[in-house]
């Protein structure tokens, strides 16, 4: 009966050698793809000279296979019933799933110019930077290949900086041959309701990026949740990509390859301003760009990115306040394409299908002392790209799941 199934499930979702969960956890059996759409700037000169609205045109998808590498340094700790690991990063370009090649060119914001002018606000340093920007023939915008933009390029302006700085720039640099973690998660041996919940990340229970409860590392990594998921639950998870914990709420019942799953979505409330959602007060880190914490839908993660003015949002500024998207033309947000969801099999708590969508933006501000930013009359949160990371349980795995889990219950 149900008790026997519960007992079997509890046993099989423990993260230790020999369980179904462990095997799929160490190396995901699902093919995970990350699609990129790049925002190609159509009017760079007008923006730089007249502070016009930025006209963007998205180009994509450019698809990479990701998360194909097994977890590394997997170490069980019997004393506190945890397992620690590193999640290695790797990306393989998939030409057949892409609209072009990694050599395709895009006009995008000059990442180094925007970042350096933000990090070094001292006017004298900005004047030094200005002379180097001019000397390197850099500008507010640049033309870069997809490969350069994502994985890194040697910046000509930063290469002239006479004190030690990283001269290689890229939105995901460094990526290949790096790893995320160390994660230490509960293995569920002593308490199945804690399975996969993160105990520490990089040796800490807090991130040191935010104030108060915003700084907490909550829940799992979203690949799985403790078993016996209820529709009424708020599922907490931590995403290192956005440097914060976030949550998902039940939206609908979905049938995935014959398996009944619960679709959990990231609600607009999670992106709301503290005016609408007081819990979000500690995600508002400054008063000027956020218009005294009234703007919403963008997250300033500069503290997590060595001071670089990176802002995370949903694609096309979905769920963002009008003032954020007002200076950008060419955006068309819609929930179906641009929201994040998790399809969770409720008995095991496994995420059998997901679509993680986010947009990477960079803040650029007027600068009195930097010529190429001198004519700007306002701040811009400039969209660089958005991504859609998806994974769906394979047919073979789905059959196995149906026969071993859902079939037995029904």
């Amino acid at each position: 009966g149900d008790l026997l199934i519960q007992k079997t499930i509890k046993k099989q979702v423990v993260l230790e050698e020999g369980t179904i969960a462990f095997k799929n956890w160490v190396k995901t059996g699902t093919e995970v793809y990350r699609q990129f759409w790049i925002f190609d700037v159509q009017n760079p000169q007008e923006v730089m000279m007249n502070s016009s609205n930025i006209q963007v045109k998205q180009r994509g998808p450019y698809t990479y296979r990701v998360r194909f590498l097994a977890k590394e340094n997997v170490t069980q700790d019997a004393e506190d019933n945890t397992v620690s690991f590193l999640q290695p990063n790797g990306a393989i370009f998939e030409p057949s799933l892409s609209v072009g090649t990694e050599a395709d060119n895009f006009t995008v914001l000059n990442l180094a110019v925007a970042a350096a002018s933000h990090i070094y606000q001292n006017q004298f340093v900005q004047m030094i930077l200005n002379s180097l920007i001019n000397k390197s023939k850099s500008s507010m915008f640049q033309v870069r290949t997809l490969r350069e933009l994502l994985w890194g390029y040697r910046d000509p302006f930063l290469s002239l900086v006479p004190y030690p700085v990283t001269t290689t720039v890229g939105l995901f640099y460094p990526y290949n041959n790096t790893a995320d973690g160390v994660y230490k998660v509960f293995n569920g041996k002593d308490n199945i309701s804690k399975v996969a919940i993160i105990d520490t990340y990089k040796g800490k229970r807090n991130l040191s990026y935010w104030e108060s409860h915003c700084d907490m590392i909550n829940g799992t990594d979203a690949a799985s949740f403790p078993p016996f998921v209820e529709k009424s639950q708020v599922l907490q998870f931590f995403s290192s990509d956005i440097c914060r914990s976030i949550y998902a709420v039940f939206e609908s019942d979905v049938n995935l390859k014959g398996i009944p799953v619960y679709r959990f979505v990231l609600p607009s409330k999670a992106f709301a301003s503290p005016v609408e959602n007081p819990d979000n007060y500690c995600f508002c880190t400054e008063k000027i760009i956020s218009k005294n914490c009234t703007s919403y839908g963008v997250l300033d993660i500069s503290k997590c990115k060595e001071g670089r003015p990176v802002y995370i949002s949903l694609p096309h500024f979905l769920y963002a306040s009008p003032d954020v998207s007002e200076p950008i033309d060419g955006l068309n947000p819609n929930e179906e394409e641009h929201r994040t969801y998790l399809d969770i099999e409720p008995i095991t708590g496994f995420t059998l299908q997901f679509a993680k969508r986010l947009q990477v933006n960079l803040l650029v501000k007027p600068s009195e002392k930097i010529q190429v930013l001198k004519n700007l009359k306002r701040n811009y949160i400039v969209p660089i790209l958005w991504l859609n990371e998806t994974g769906t349980i394979g047919d073979e795995k789905a059959n196995m799941f149906r026969s071993q889990v859902t079939g037995k219950i029904n």
């Epitope: 001292n122 006017q123 340093v125 200005n130 004190y163």
Partner: antibody, heavy 118, light 107 residues
Framework: EVQLQQSGPELVKPGASVKISCETS????????MHWVKQSHGKSLEWIGG????????KYNQKFKGKATLTVDKSSSTAYMELRSLTSEDSAVYYC???????????WGQGTLVTVSA | ETTVTQSPASLSMAIGEKVTIRCITS??????MNWYQQKPGEPPKLLIS???TLRPGVPSRFSSSGYGTDFIFTIENMLSEDVADYYC?????????FGAGTKLELK
């Protein structure tokens, strides 16, 4: 109160070097640029260069490249300027001056008189 | 390098008179001009910073105007304590450059 205290007058021989100090107090030393300015007797002011203590970024007036070297000691909140291969042309009062946010040369030291004479 | 041409080199004015000093730059510097006063045996003192901004504590008889390449510094009603050398400084680009100075004397 922000104060810039410079070292005393120097009498040096041609060809020698001299190192002038500018000790600061009353502010966060690393956050503000320290500049050095030359004033020859009865003449105008000339910007020698500046240093941002936070990251050591320096910029020199081309005219003083090879003549002046700017350094800082963060632990003692002191800025230094070394002048080398001195000639009579280098005889002048040298000032250190500090910025305040977006204001140039908001605070000045009292000046150091350097006399180059055989 | 932006050169700054300051005029006149010297000026002799009576108390209560209006004093005008001019600086012309070789390049367009927007409003990035600063004005300093120096009394004998003292370091210069900042009176007016970029954007024609009068510094706190500086009497309102001092003012400046100008944009681009042409800048004017004015003392509305000269007092005896205003006897000093006056310098303009462009801070639009490096190297920072000063005008040659104006010696203001009492008539």
């Amino acid at each position: 109160e922000v104060q810039l205290q410079q070292s005393g007058p120097e009498l040096v021989k041609p060809g020698a070097s001299v190192k002038i100090s500018c000790e600061t107090s009353g502010h966060t030393f690393t956050e503000y640029t320290m500049h050095w300015v030359k004033q020859s007797h009865g003449k105008s002011l000339e910007w020698i260069g500046g240093i941002y203590p936070n990251n050591g970024a320096t910029k020199y007036n081309q005219k003083f490249k090879g003549k002046a070297t700017l350094t800082v000691d963060k632990s003692s909140s002191t800025a230094y300027m070394e002048l080398r291969s001195l000639t009579s042309e280098d005889s002048a009062v040298y000032y250190c001056a500090r910025d305040r946010y977006d204001v140039w040369f908001a605070y000045w030291g009292q000046g150091t008189l350097v006399t180059v004479s055989a | 390098e932006t050169t700054v041409t300051q005029s006149p080199a010297s000026l002799s004015m009576a108390i209560g008179e209006k004093v005008t000093i001019r600086c012309i730059t070789s390049t367009d510097i927007d409003d990035d001009m600063n004005w300093y006063q120096q009394k004998p045996g003292e370091p210069p003192k900042l009176l007016i910073s970029e954007g024609n901004t009068l510094r706190p504590g500086v009497p309102s008889r001092f003012s400046s105007s100008g944009y681009g390449t042409d800048f004017i510094f004015t003392i509305e009603n000269m007092l005896s304590e205003d006897v000093a050398d006056y310098y303009c400084l462009q801070s639009d680009n490096l190297p920072l450059t000063f005008g040659a100075g104006t010696k203001l004397e009492l008539k």
